[in-house]
């Protein structure tokens, strides 16, 4: 059963797909593996706050602490990466704020560039100075834990020297890493001391050890690879938008709704209205009017502009966004002031959202 009654029979489906909207990422919190992360739920007047990660309820455990409006993750790991949400439940409504957590220290090991500069890692020794293998560039090996999005390319490097020149081999989870162990195999560039895996998948997760050896000794170094998987999600609306606004009678005002969506978002601007002096229909559902929606005849649907407003325009404006996965909505209030109460200027006075660090 729909949760509202439409005042007029508005066709909500666009006649053809609207153009893609400029979409906005939710706020991203970045932590290195092992660090602690604290995030404050940026919602006001929350009686009860509940938390989710990737749509699944998040409860306290030995690493996750939920205190009031704060979420603390102790000793973050790449598995903590994802789309988080806090929902503030109030007596009359609820509101959700989304944010991303990214626990990662690099997309790939060593250089992010192609191995154009790798030649300096290939160290030639004076033939008389016999020497066991040693690392020539430990800076490129400091990052041991790598969280990589699925389908990306991973490069692990173990720049080494020695005399005679050492050989390099790779192990996965302590066993010989063979080409047939992964679809598409892998590349080893001996002159750059690197292992390259293209288009990583979850089965590539694990420990990768380079073993560098010659007749005088052997050294090894282990990297841990975690493949961060990606899933489609319902629309995300930027916290704090649309923002409450006020203007005088006759003024103009704009509400903005920033949308982040993998899939085509369908945007509606909705207002509570009265019909026959009542705000609610016989079924007890509120009367709502669709003021604007994305579609063939609609300009930038993320913006609702109101011109020459009257006192009747005061009230709550809802930005409702849907895609094939689900919905999200946020609202703002418009206050219309009599002209004599105009604070300074007559044109719009818009309240900017508060961005809290």
């Amino acid at each position: 059963r729909p949760s509202f009654s439409l005042v007029e029979d508005t066709t909500l489906e666009p006649e053809e797909p609207p153009t893609k909207y400029q979409i906005s990422q939710p706020e991203v919190y970045v932590a290195a593996p092992g660090e602690s992360l604290e995030v404050r739920c940026l919602l006001k007047d929350a009686a009860v706050i509940s938390w989710t990660k990737d749509g699944v309820h998040l409860g306290p455990n030995n690493r996750t602490v939920l205190i009031g409006e704060y979420l603390q993750i102790k000793g973050a790991t790449p598995r903590d990466s994802g789309l988080y949400a806090c929902t503030a439940s109030r007596t009359v409504d609820s509101e959700t704020w989304y944010f991303m957590v990214n626990v990662t220290d690099a997309i790939s090991s060593g250089d992010d560039e192609d191995d154009t500069d790798g030649a300096e890692d290939f160290v030639s020794e004076n033939s008389n100075n016999k020497r066991a293998p040693y690392w020539t560039n430990t800076e490129k090996m400091e990052k041991r834990l790598h969280a990589v999005p699925a389908a990306n390319t991973v490069k692990f490097r173990c720049p080494a020297g020695g005399n005679p020149m050492p050989t390099m081999r790779w192990l996965k989870n302590g066993k010989e890493f063979k080409q047939e162990h992964r679809i598409g195999g892998y590349k080893v560039r001996n002159q750059h001391w690197s292992l390259i895996m293209e288009s990583v998948v979850p089965s590539d997760k694990g420990n990768y050890t380079c073993v560098v050896e010659n007749e005088y000794g052997s050294i090894n170094h282990t990297y841990h690879l975690d493949v961060v998987e990606r899933s489609p999600h319902r629309p995300i609306l930027q916290a704090g938008l649309p923002a409450n606004a006020s203007t005088v009678v006759g003024g103009d005002v704009e509400f903005v709704c920033k949308v982040y969506s993998d899939a085509q978002p369908h945007i509606q601007w909705i207002k509570h209205v009265e019909k026959n002096g009542s705000k609610y229909g016989p079924d007890g559902l509120p009367y709502l009017k669709v003021l604007k929606h994305s579609g063939i005849n609609s300009s930038n649907a993320e913006v609702l502009a109101l011109f020459n407003v009257t006192e009747a325009d005061a009230g709550e404006y809802i930005c409702k966004v849907s895609n094939y996965i689900g919905q999200a909505n946020q609202s703002a209030w418009l206050t219309v002031l009599p002209k004599q109460q105009a604070p300074g200027r007559e044109k719009e006075i818009t309240a900017s959202p508060d961005y809290l660090e």
Partner: antibody
Framework: QVQLVQSGAEVKKPGSSVKVSCKAS????????VHWVRQAPGQGLEWIGS????????SYNQNFRGRATITADKSTSTAYMELSSLRSEDTAVYYC???????WGQGTLVTVSS | DIQMTQSPSSLSASVGDRVTITCKAS??????IAWYQQKPGKAPKLLIY???YRYSGVPSRFSGSGSGTDFTFTISSLQPEDIATYYC?????????FGQGTKLEIK
């Protein structure tokens, strides 16, 4: 883990109605659409409609409008699809799927026969 | 409604072959297309969404590309377990329409 469990097979007479249920678990039921898709024997997939359980918003394929009714019960995390005025060509496997189409029910075979 | 024209309707290939299936939308749908694999008696399985994103756990031999009206689904090296029917689906606007399917067989 995410699961969608559908009700069992049904045999119906032409002109009657059928109501198929889809019980969801392992995720927040109100955060995703539930879609209904059908597949006639040996045929392709046809989208019937969807519901957003949080507020009951529904969307239908015009081919089924008036005959299909999709509802959801938040208290039991269950979605329903009722199809009325059944005819023999409605014989099909009916699937529910989570909003992202990443998880599907096992399917419910509805046979319409006199 | 947006029509999704999928081709070929069936194809036969050998293990290790590169297999390509195409889907053409009657209207521009940006990148709002998904690809599914369905085996007999089973529900469809999501492989690709938003034209090119592999869903979690899907092997890297499956890939998708395209934008607007023309889309391609590729299996880079066919494996015996890939024998199934494959469907495209637009998820831009309702009704979310499917292609008619491509039945893939091993030579």
């Amino acid at each position: 883990q995410v699961q969608l469990v559908q009700s069992g097979a049904e045999v119906k007479k032409p002109g009657s109605s059928v109501k198929v249920s889809c019980k969801a678990s392992g995720y927040i039921f109100t955060s995703y659409n539930v879609h209904w898709v059908r597949q006639a024997p040996g045929q392709g997939l046809e989208w019937i409609g969807s519901i957003y359980p949080d507020n009951g918003d529904t969307s239908y394929n015009q081919n089924f409008r008036g005959r299909a009714t999709i509802t959801a019960d938040k208290s039991t995390s269950t979605a329903y699809m009722e199809l009325s005025s059944l005819r023999s060509e409605d014989t099909a496997v009916y699937y529910c799927a989570r909003g992202d189409f990443a998880y599907w029910g096992q399917g419910t075979l509805v046979t319409v026969s006199s | 409604d947006i029509q999704m024209t999928q081709s070929p309707s069936s194809l036969s290939a050998s293990v290790g072959d590169r297999v390509t299936i195409t889907c053409k939308a009657s209207n521009g749908i940006s990148n709002d297309i998904a690809w599914y694999q369905q085996k007999p008696g089973k529900a469809p399985k999501l492989l690709i969404y938003s034209a090119s994103y592999r869903y979690s756990g899907v092997p890297s031999r499956f890939s998708g590309s395209g934008s607007g009206t023309d889309f391609t689904f590729t299996i880079s090296s066919l494996q015996p377990e890939d024998i199934a029917t494959y469907y495209c689906q637009q998820h831009s606007t309702t009704p979310y329409t499917f292609g008619q399917g491509t039945k893939l067989e091993i030579k």
